[in-house]
């Protein structure tokens, strides 16, 4: 388990509903977000990265390997 800071959605929502996929990037305020190990069913969710489970949202997110981006780390960064 761990935690980090992240920014809310641009509409001010804290993305707290179970199942929501939060992708906002516009800073508003720093929010402490806690993570846990991803459920086994998401083992293959992150293609080029590591899966983590956002506790408040109860949804997986990915930490991408260098050179990859996208919700599932599925896109190659051609400028990397």
């Amino acid at each position: 388990d761990g935690n980090t800071t992240r920014t809310p959605e641009t509409n001010g929502s804290l993305c707290g509903a179970p199942g929501e996929n939060c992708t906002g990037t516009t800073p508003r305020q720093k929010v402490k977000t806690h993570f846990s190990r991803c459920p086994k069913q998401y083992k293959h969710y992150c293609i080029h990265g590591r899966c983590r489970f956002v506790v408040d949202e109860q949804t997986p997110s990915c930490i991408c390997e260098k050179g990859y981006f996208g919700a599932r780390c599925e896109r190659v960064d051609l400028f990397y």
């Epitope: 179970p18 199942g19 929501e20 996929n21 992708t23 086994k40």
Partner: antibody, heavy 116, light 106 residues
């Protein structure tokens, strides 16, 4: 307010096909995972399938794998379930529900009856 | 597959009673467990997620506890609107529900 409205249910013969739809409103559909969950008459709940927000990550229950296909159209705020090779044991109320792991909002359900 | 076993399958209780429903997973699921309430002819309603977190808008008389394989839903003081069927659901491996516990009026 969040609304999920299923349609497309009905009576179909064994071996037949049916396509269910779920129209979503009241939330940003493209940001959420969505699932199908079913309930046979007088029985418990059974998760059927989910699809992630982008439509690229999908899972199915073993009981429907290879016969059912989940999909979504984020431009239309609509979820689909294509059901092929239907069996009597697929008879159930089919709910669409918001979320992939947990289901915080549900539709009212649509009844699928598979019978000859 | 992970099997979820609820007990009891049904129970009779009176308004004001403390009610406890248990759910056992066939293998460890950490805290990846939810609880739902369903009334006849209606869709289920999420009560508890992550084993012990109360879903927004759910009365505080509902609480959840447990981790690993053994989990509990407690209603501290049963209200008339609480007579319903309750389901647990694990979401570590692919989602599976318990068979349900029907709470009836004594």
């Amino acid at each position: 307010q969040v609304q999920l409205l299923e349609s497309g249910g009905g009576l179909v013969q064994p071996g037949g096909s049916l396509r269910l739809s779920c129209a979503a409103s009241g939330f940003t559909f493209s940001r959420y995972w969505i699932s199908w969950v079913r309930q046979a008459p007088g029985k418990g709940l059974e998760w059927v399938s989910y699809i992630d927000s982008t439509g690229t990550f999908i899972n199915y229950a073993d009981s429907v794998k290879g016969r059912f296909t989940i999909s979504r159209d984020n431009s239309k705020n609509t979820l689909y379930l294509q059901m092929n090779s239907l069996r009597a044991e697929d008879t159930a109320v089919y709910y669409c529900a918001r979320g992939g792991s947990l289901f915080d909002y549900w539709g009212q359900g649509t009844l699928v009856t598979v019978s000859s | 597959d992970i099997q979820m076993t609820q007990s009891p399958s049904s129970l009779s209780a009176s308004v004001g009673d403390r009610v406890t429903i248990t759910c056992r997973a066939s293998q460890g699921i950490i805290s990846y467990l939810g609880w739902y309430q369903q009334k006849p002819g209606k869709a289920p309603k999420l009560l508890i997620y992550a084993a012990s977190s109360l879903q927004s808008g759910v009365p505080s008389r509902f609480s959840g506890s447990g981790s690993g394989t053994d989990f509990t839903l407690t209603i501290s003081s049963l209200q008339p609107e609480d007579f319903a069927t309750y389901y647990c659901q694990q979401y570590d491996a692919l989602n599976t529900f318990g068979q349900g516990t029907k709470v009836e009026i004594k």
